[in-house]
Amino acid sequence: DVSEYSCRELHFTRYVTDGPCRSAKPVTELVCSGQCGPARLLPNAIGRGKWWRPSGPDFRCIPDRYRAQRVQLLCPGGEAPRARKVRLVASCKCKRLTRFHNQS
């Protein structure tokens, strides 16, 4: 018996860049990682062995909610800071994969 695989929210910090300009502070967002279960022990159709693979609908750990955040971009040459809004992942969830979701 295999417990449900975890859909993890990993914190990732990065600077926002636009050409030669970079955000004054880094932004922290979530990266969705892990697998969604439960998984079952299913027969390997090719050989005699068995392997783990999810059965039924294909669920993926993908972004569930987003948030907006304004960043100030500092540019070389004394230009005034530019304002930019970025879309960041705010939470992750196991969701049924549809043809609209990126397969990667």
């Epitope: 636009d18 050409g19 300009c21 909610r65 987003y66 948030r67 907006a68 955040q69 304004r70 540019c75 230009e79 005034a80 800071p81 530019r82 304002a83 930019r84 809004k85 970025v86 879309r87 705010a90």
Partner: antibody
């Protein structure tokens, strides 16, 4: 369908305060900043400031700092703008507008709220 | 603040005419600019974003272009329903600033 429904017209006396609302529907309220814009009669538009409903963080045009206060009620998806110490210069139509990241901010607007300041 | 100088403040044209109006930014090298149409008693409506991208549902007779800090809105063949005031907006620098508007009348 994205909709921004603003509160009705206000007639207020000089020195008083007014609080106008903007009820958002058709999208996740906390995903987008909400801006407020002033349009005096027959004049251009002025950006008052905006609020991030997710964090409550506000950014103001220096011109309106100290007179305008932006807040949100996340549970009911309503953005508010309060203006204090009203003068005749504050008589205008005020709009809320959803900010769509860098691509197309202000793609969705409320219908406007007319505020008249008169003794 | 970045000032957006819009011209002309008003113009009159005939149906079918090509109409152009401009906004010039007082400073800034990376202006993100939108164009709006506003009819009397109504809220502004987004026409063009990112200087030249047509918003969904906007007729293709509207187009936007940029040359340095000069931005142009062009209506290729004027129609009755285009009677309105047009505004530009820069949203790259705080505070966001609008142009003074161009009131378009039909001859």
């Amino acid at each position: 369908e994205v909709q921004l429904q603003q509160s009705g017209p206000e007639l207020v006396t000089p020195g008083a305060s007014v609080k106008i609302s903007c009820k958002a529907s058709g999208y996740t309220f906390t995903d987008h900043y909400m801006s407020w814009v002033k349009q005096s009669h027959g004049k251009s538009l002025e950006w008052i400031g905006d609020i991030n409903p997710y964090s409550g963080e506000t950014t103001y045009n220096q011109k309106f700092k100290g007179t305008a206060t932006l807040t949100v009620d996340k549970s009911s998806s309503i953005a508010y703008m309060e203006i204090r110490g009203l003068t005749s210069e504050d008589s205008a139509v005020y709009y809320c507008a959803r900010d769509d990241y860098d691509a197309s901010p202000f793609a969705y607007w409320g219908q406007g709220t007319l505020v008249t300041v008169s003794a | 603040d970045v000032q957006m100088i819009q011209s002309p403040s008003s113009l009159s044209a005939s149906l079918g005419d090509i109409v152009t109006m401009t906004c010039q930014a007082s400073q800034g090298t990376s202006i993100n600019l939108n164009w709006f149409q506003q009819k009397p008693g109504k809220a502004p409506k987004l026409l063009i974003y990112g200087s030249s991208n047509l918003e969904d549902g906007v007729p293709s007779r509207f187009s936007g272009s940029r040359y340095g800090t000069d931005f142009t809105l062009t209506i290729s063949s004027l129609e009755d329903e285009d009677l309105a005031t047009y505004f530009c907006l820069q949203h790259s620098y705080l505070p966001y600033t609008f142009g003074g508007g161009t009131k378009l009348e039909i001859k």
